[in-house]
Amino acid sequence: NFMYSKTVKRLSKLREYQQYHPSLTCVMEGKDIEDWSCCPTPWTSFQSSCYFISTGMQSWTKSQKNCSVMGADLVVINTREEQDFIIQNLKRNSSYFLGLSDPGGRRHWQWVDQTPYNENVTFWHSGEPNNLDERCAIINFRSSEEWGWNDIHCHVPQKSICKMKKIYI
């Protein structure tokens, strides 16, 4: 029977993801009972992605490794709407690594997922990025400008934001 085979497929997919995430929160997409989209519990979801705020303080490299262990990457922010969603879950007195770095110190910024960096769609604080030796990007709160990005030294431990595609089962 169709529903039975669909359930069996779902269960095998869920087993696949259990190595990363013991628990998933799933919602039915639209009216079709066949399509469920899931995020690991307790990640948050926005559009087609899941987000996790990591409160452990680590360097940029270790933060990216921490995300990848969970099947994710440091966050790539593509739109103002996405940033507006993310900041709802951040603390104003903390800074969080983004998946954005300038490894050569040439101001050729790179996103971890190879999305081409487009300065027209960036949210740097005014006057940033301002130091060739500061090669990793964070998002933080400044009272004058609200939330924005800043370049910092990559080895300085920060909190971080992980992002992964929603799991469809």
């Epitope: 040439r106 101001r107 050729h108 999305t115 081409p116 487009n118 300065e119 027209n120 740097w124």
Partner: nanobody, 120 residues
């Protein structure tokens, strides 16, 4: 294919000034950072100054206070005003641009270089 054309190099006496220009042409969607690099004989190419699309500039320590980078986004052009030149500034100066050819295709473009000689 994007072309970068430098101009403004030449021979100048110590303490003198030069203004380099670099214009980008070709199929360009947008340009992120634009910068100037230099390579002295027998040395590696090094970054001199770089400027973001929004006008944030960064300089290497050896030129701070003497060189000024600027750009005209409408003309896809970057400039380098060089004051108080000294013989150590003698080098071939290369323009570089981080170009978006389309919203999802990126190219690291270089000019052919312009020679700057500081000598009395």
């Amino acid at each position: 294919q994007v072309q970068l054309q430098e101009s403004g190099g030449g021979l100048v006496q110590p303490g003198g000034s030069l203004r380099l220009s670099c214009a980008a042409s070709g199929r360009i969607f947008s340009i992120n950072a634009m910068g100037w690099y230099r390579q002295a004989p027998g040395k590696q190419r090094e970054l001199v100054a770089v400027i973001s699309r929004s006008g944030i500039s960064n300089y290497v320590d050896s030129v701070k206070g003497r060189f000024t980078i600027s750009r005209d986004n409408a003309k896809n052009t970057v400039y380098l005003q060089m004051n108080s030149l000294n013989p150590e500034d003698t080098a071939d100066y290369y323009c570089n641009a981080d170009v978006l050819l389309t919203f999802n295709k990126r190219e690291d473009s270089w000019g052919q270089g312009t020679q700057v000689t500081v000598s009395s």
